[in-house]
Each structure stands twice: as structure tokens, then as C-alpha cells.
């Protein structure tokens, strides 16, 4: 009886790490806010994957702001995050690449990718939207970078840094710069509004990248995509500040707000947040 057989193949939770490497707010850019105080705070930089110092103006800003380095590390870095870097440097896959795909206990029909240890490839699966495990990537590219072997036996990490197989050094990858202004907020801010597959009518906001504004839409309650916010303020905070201006070698741009110019160091070049 096949039903009986399947009861003996329950996928157990042995040593499964939590789903998310960090909280969603850890991915927010450092935001000094509109006020003029000079307060030393810490934020998690998703590009360097480290907690770094920044100057906070004393009001507004976002949740990616911590009083101490320790608090920042506690909230935004986990052993798993360190393990990604460590194991990549050792040319090994992180442990979670070997976990079976886990849709989680919710059912939101979200397309995600996992590393299939049988086929040695990243494959698509339907994620339910909550819980699950860390073998769960938003893009095929990210999954491949972290869990698949590169063509020459090296691994590639997911922030544009390649591990050189010869001398184990981290080499920045060149990036094409098509224009002076680029969108460097979360990629989902560029996706269209997606109602999802359920039957609810929840009031949500999405970022309309064509007009550059947050607009309301009706969310079905499950599925959809990540361009989906419970408030206009949250939408603006996540997506509106994503437009940046690239300047060659350490130049500064003037911002509309009269206060010190603050550089935000990201990856391998200096970029500056354009206030909008």
C-alpha cells in the first residue's frame, strides 16, 4: 500500500536551521533620517554581510538601526550567515544546501528555488510563504551561486564576488553601468503588483516603478510577490530610496537636504543615496 509506505518517509527536521538568514529589515539600506543629530548607530550591510557603523540623524529612519554592534549582530547575523562565507571560502557548500525542499506549513504558491542534492542542480519549487528551511532562494541565480559548483570547481557567492580557485582570493566582479541613475533598491520593487491566488481582498500597496510612486492594490491573501506592503510608508521606505547615482572614484553629490553628506559604502564602490 503506497499510503503506508509514504508514512515511513516523513521528512524530519533534523538540524534544520531557520528559514531566513536575517530579518527582512536587515536588508534595508542605512537610513539617517531627516533630522540633524549626529548619533553613532549600527546597521547590517547586506553586501558585506557585516554590521557597520553609520551616523543617524535622530528621527525616523528604519528598523535596520541598532544601538550597539552586538545588538546588530544578534538581530541580523546568524551562525548560518557566517557559515555561508566560511564554507564558500573553503569551496564547500553550506549545510542547508543538502536539506530537502520544504514548502512550509502555509500555502501561498510562491516560486522559489532549492538545491537538489540528487540532481546536483538548483530547481524550482512552490513555497508556501512561511517557515520551511534555508534551502530556499528567491532566484535561480542566488541558489546556483550558493549551492551549485561553478564550472571550474569554484563556488560563487551571491553578492557579485567570485572565489578564485587558484589562490582562494575574493575577486570583485565587474558590473555594467548603463546610466548615471540606477535602481538599487530591492529587485521586487520593479515587479508588477500581483494579487495572488486566494480570495481575500486585503488593502496593500505596491511600488509602481514606471511612475515612481506607491499605489494601492487588493491582495488576495496568499501568493503574489514581494512588491507588497501593508502601508504606503513601508512601501516608500523600501522602494523609493532605491534610486542611486553612481559617481566615479569617491566623488560626492549634493543632496536636497541641508546636512552633512553621508557616504554609504556598499560592495566595491562608493555610491550615494539620492533623497527623493
Amino acid at each position: 500500500d503506497s499510503e503506508e509506505d509514504e508514512e515511513h518517509t516523513i521528512i524530519t527536521d533534523t538540524e534544520l536551521p531557520p528559514l531566513k538568514l536575517m530579518h527582512s529589515f536587515c536588508a534595508f539600506k542605512a537610513d539617517d533620517g531627516p533630522c540633524k543629530a549626529i548619533m553613532k548607530r549600527f546597521f547590517f550591510n547586506i553586501f558585506t554581510r557585516q554590521c557597520e557603523e553609520f551616523i543617524y540623524g535622530g528621527c525616523e529612519g528604519n528598523q535596520n538601526r541598532f544601538e550597539s554592534l552586538e545588538e546588530c549582530k544578534k538581530m541580523c547575523t546568524r551562525d548560518n550567515a557566517n557559515r555561508i562565507i566560511k564554507t564558500t571560502l573553503q569551496q564547500e557548500k553550506p549545510d542547508f544546501c543538502f536539506l530537502e525542499e520544504d514548502p512550509g506549513i502555509c500555502r501561498g504558491y510562491i516560486t522559489r528555488y532549492f538545491y537538489n542534492n540528487q540532481t546536483k542542480q538548483c530547481e524550482r519549487f512552490k513555497y508556501g510563504g512561511c517557515l520551511g528551511n534555508m534551502n530556499n532562494f528567491e532566484t535561480l541565480e542566488e541558489c546556483k551561486n550558493i549551492c551549485e559548483d561553478g564550472p571550474n570547481g569554484f563556488q560563487v557567492d551571491n553578492y557579485g564576488t567570485q572565489l578564485n580557485a587558484v589562490n582562494n582570493s575574493l575577486t570583485p566582479q565587474s558590473t555594467k553601468v548603463p546610466s548615471l541613475f540606477e535602481f538599487h533598491g530591492p529587485s521586487w520593487c520593479l515587479t508588477p503588483a500581483d494579487r495572488g491566488l486566494c480570495r481575500a481582498n486585503e488593502n496593500r500597496f505596491y511600488y509602481n516603478s514606471v511612475i515612481g510612486k506607491c499605489r494601492p492594490f487588493k491582495y488576495s491573501g496568499c501568493g503574489g510577490n514581494e512588491n507588497n506592503f501593508t502601508s504606503k510608508q513601508e512601501c516608500l521606505r523600501a522602494c523609493k530610496k532605491g534610486f542611486i547615482q553612481r559617481i566615479s572614484k569617491g566623488g560626492l553629490i549634493k543632496t536636497k537636504r541641508k546636512r552633512k553628506k553621508q557616504r554609504v559604502k556598499i560592495a566595491y564602490e562608493e555610491i550615494f543615496v539620492k533623497n527623493m
Epitope: 518517509t9 527536521d13 500555502r107 512561511c130 480570495r199 510577490n225 501593508t230
Partner: antibody, heavy 123, light 112 residues
């Protein structure tokens, strides 16, 4: 209307195994739009989630670390029920045990609960 | 584990008056596509818990509209616009951002 009917002994001796069953009517234990859980409640610890099982392309389970080495939750598809086994019990395991359905579709939450079974661990 | 802390632990109320219960999580419960991984339950005396609010702010079926949930990040609130006698019991918040699923310690609402 989903109903969960719990059964099992109310008294278990220390070091023995606590076994409870939750019979489901109005839904299927194999449903891909539900997950099935055990939760206990005691004055000292409040509501404590113990574990959950669910079937999607295959069966999955997750357990609380606090009981992980002692717990097993199994589905019984032929009887449309699921069970809890907790080994090597101590008086600290004395609690009201609830089975609950996690609604996986629109309403993400424990939307149906069993009536609760008071289990006392005592010699 | 994510720790859920409720306040107050006891709330004496007057029928017809509003009531508010706070729940604070040790980590943020907002997922990236706007869903808040927090539910509210009510356990009436001698009964099993029942789902009141799911995903932070959505009323479960059959729940009167005097109940509302709000909040984001780590701070959440359950409000009863006008308390009725049948609303007495213990209210719990619960997170499902990460395993293990955890509940608050409960807020006991009783009539003055």
C-alpha cells in the same frame, strides 16, 4: 465544519510513553491545505507548541527542540487521524494536551482545536 | 526562540468600554511581502483556544468586528472597541516567523 476529537489516557507513569490520538472529521490528514499540530498548556509554561506534520508532495514534520528527542507525531491516513507519542515522561510533562489544525490556505493560523486532554504524569 | 511578551497580564474591563492588549516579539515578524506572521487567540473559560486574528490584522471567520489587530515589526496590539461580557477569557498572541512556534504568556480579561 472541521472537528478534532482527542482520545488517550489521562494518567501516565513517569518514564513511560504518553500516547494521544486526534481523529479528524470534515478534513483530511493528507490535505495539502492544512497542517496538524500538538500543543500543550500548563500553568507553569502556558501554551507550548510541540510539533507539526503536513503533507505536500510528501510528509514533513517539525518538532520543538525542548521535546525533539522524545516526540513522534504520525499520520494515520486509513483512519484519518494523527497521533502524539512522548517518551520518557516526567511530572513536568503534566499538562492539557491539544491537537490543532493549522489552516494553510488563506487563514494562516490554528483555526480548529481539539477539546483538550488533561494528562497527569504521576506514579 | 522568539519570545512573545504580552502586557498587561490582567485587564479588568467595563462592558461597553474599549480594551487594548499589547504583544511584543523579540524579533521582527514582518516578512518581505507585507505579511505579518502573528496571530491572536482567545481562550474562554473551560474551552480550547479559538483563532481571532490572523496575519496580524485579519479577523477569522465569525469574529465580531469589534476586534481588530494592528502593529508591525515587533509591536502588536489587539483592540476591542466595546467590550462585551462574552469577551472574557485569556488572550494570546502567537508568532510563526520561525520555529518553534511560540505564544505569549496570555492576558486575562475580566469584567470589573
Amino acid at each position: 465544519q472541521v472537528q478534532l476529537q482527542q482520545s488517550g489516557p489521562g494518567l501516565v507513569k513517569p518514564s513511560q510513553t504518553l500516547s494521544l490520538t486526534c481523529a479528524i472529521s470534515g478534513d483530511s490528514v493528507s490535505s495539502d491545505s492544512a497542517a496538524w499540530s500538538w500543543i500543550r498548556q500548563s500553568p507553569g509554561r502556558g501554551l507550548e507548541w510541540l510539533g507539526i506534520i503536513y503533507k505536500r508532495s510528501k510528509w514533513y514534520n517539525r518538532y520543538a527542540v525542548s521535546v525533539k528527542s522524545r516526540i513522534t507525531i504520525n499520520p494515520d491516513t486509513s483512519k484519518n487521524q494523527f497521533s502524539l507519542q512522548l517518551n520518557s515522561v516526567t511530572p513536568e510533562d503534566t499538562a492539557v494536551y491539544y491537537c490543532a489544525r493549522w489552516h494553510s490556505d488563506k487563514m494562516w493560523g490554528f483555526d480548529d482545536w481539539g477539546q483538550g486532554t488533561l494528562v497527569t504524569v504521576s506514579s | 526562540d522568539i519570545v512573545m511578551t504580552q502586557s498587561p497580564l490582567s485587564l479588568p474591563v467595563t462592558p461597553g468600554e474599549p480594551a487594548s492588549i499589547s504583544c511584543r516579539s523579540s524579533q521582527s515578524l514582518v516578512f518581505s511581502f507585507g505579511t505579518t506572521f502573528l496571530n491572536w487567540y482567545l481562550q474562554k473559560p473551560g474551552q480550547s483556544p479559538q483563532l481571532l486574528i490572523y496575519k496580524g490584522s485579519n479577523r477569522a471567520s465569525g469574529v465580531p468586528d469589534r476586534f481588530s489587530g494592528s502593529g508591525s515589526g515587533t509591536d502588536f496590539t489587539l483592540k476591542i472597541s466595546r467590550v462585551e461580557a462574552e469577551d472574557v477569557g485569556v488572550y494570546y498572541c502567537q508568532q510563526y516567523d520561525s520555529y518553534p512556534l511560540t505564544f505569549g504568556q496570555g492576558t486575562k480579561v475580566e469584567i470589573k
